[in-house]
């Protein structure tokens, strides 16, 4: 079958998920497409533990995550509920800042140099992190 029980080559396993860390930059949409073609999605941060893990691997570099607010409320790409979930915004963020001169506000979230989150223009070429969950069924004991 297509069940994934271990991480692909060059991916890092952590807490039953696999992570891939880019070393180049892409616009958010291109990063998102890249992850989907790998059967994954842009990273969805659900806990402080996961935040620390990702932060450790990306270092002090602006890096896209799978969070956007293009259609109103903030949304995680995998459907994880934003309102009740983990958040780690920088103080006074997100601010949908128009002062960058591009106009139109900021609709995609990224890790900043200190790991906390900021909203920014989606077409900026930042690094990104893909995540895919190891098959949950493989955690269950075999049926007798």
């Amino acid at each position: 079958g297509s069940e994934r029980t271990c991480c692909p080559v060059n991916w890092v396993e952590h807490e039953r998920s696999c992570y891939w860390f880019s070393r180049s930059g892409k616009a958010w949409a291109d990063a998102d497409n890249y992850c989907r073609l790998e059967d994954a999605h842009l990273v969805v941060v659900t806990s402080w533990e996961e935040q620390k893990f990702v932060q450790h691997h990306i270092g002090p570099v602006n890096t896209w995550m799978g969070l956007h607010d293009q259609n109103g409320p903030w949304k995680w790409v995998d459907g994880t509920d934003y309102e009740t979930g983990f958040k780690n915004w920088r103080p006074e963020q997100p601010d949908d800042w128009y002062g960058h001169g591009l106009g139109g506000g900021e609709d995609c979230a990224h890790f900043t140099d200190d790991g906390r989150w900021n909203d920014d223009v989606c077409q900026r070429p930042y690094r990104w992190v893909c995540e895919t969950e190891l098959d949950k069924a493989s955690q269950e004991p075999p049926l007798l």
């Epitope: 616009a27 958010w28 949409a29 998102d32 497409n33 989907r36 073609l37 790998e38 059967d39 956007h68 293009q70 790409v77 001169g101 591009l102 106009g103 139109g104 506000g105 609709d107 995609c108 223009v121 989606c122 077409q123």
Partner: antibody
């Protein structure tokens, strides 16, 4: 509200050139990638070209590569499509469309301008 | 190049549910978007990124994507839903549309 208005269409002979324009209003034009999409009479939609919000990247469909050039003037809130070496198969309604930036889709479209290539 | 396959036509009885499919190799790995086009009008985005509805689009419109098929579902079909519907993806820096499906509401 968001408005996209195409102009510049008309009847042109094969091998000749035409430049289409798309005037944008109601949003900050300089923030968005923009596309041209065309539709031949009675046929389906065909993507033509895209240009990044700052003009830094441009991509084209194979069918127009080397003949069409997409450009923009953010100071004039206008998108352009320069069409050279036109062929009969380029006959279509040409739409400009705005890209939201979240996966290359088109949330607002103009009403289109008809280009007819005929001798 | 990537290809998207749609049925030429789909019919649905008034008030019933219409399903329009869009086939592509491992399409689940791609963001699929759907447009509605009525005669003489420009297309309108009805679903983006597989299942998201733009503001102003009725909840009757929904989308899904798995395996080799993406599906646009229109529940409680109305006469005003009669139109052509196109799926679309992005592949290798190129926009790709399906051939379109004519929805007829009986």
């Amino acid at each position: 509200q968001v408005q996209l208005v195409e102009s510049g269409g008309g009847v042109v002979q094969p091998g000749r050139s035409l430049r289409l324009s798309c005037a944008a209003s109601g949003f900050t034009f300089s923030s968005y990638a923009m596309h041209w999409v065309r539709q031949a009479p009675g046929k389906g939609l065909e993507w033509v070209a895209v240009i990044w919000y700052d003009g830094s990247n441009k991509y084209y469909a194979d069918s127009v590569k080397g003949r069409f050039t997409i450009s923009r003037d953010n100071s004039k809130n206008t998108l352009y499509l320069q069409m050279n070496s036109l062929r009969a198969e380029d006959t279509a309604v040409y739409y400009c469309a705005r890209d939201l930036g979240l996966g290359y889709f088109f949330d607002y479209w103009g009403q289109g301008t008809l280009v007819t290539v005929s001798s | 190049s990537y290809e998207l396959t749609q049925p030429l036509s789909v019919s649905v009885a008034l008030g019933q549910t219409a399903r329009i499919t869009c086939g592509g190799d491992n399409i689940r790995r791609r963001n699929v978007h759907w447009y509605q086009q009525k005669p003489g009008q420009a297309p309108v985005l009805v679903i983006y990124r597989d299942s998201n509805r733009p503001s102003g689009i009725p909840e009757r419109f929904s989308g899904s994507n798995s395996g080799n098929t993406a599906t646009l579902t229109i529940s409680r079909a109305q006469a005003g839903d009669e139109a052509d519907y196109y799926c679309q993806v992005w592949d290798s820096s190129t926009g790709v549309f399906g051939g379109g499906t004519k929805l007829t509401v009986l």
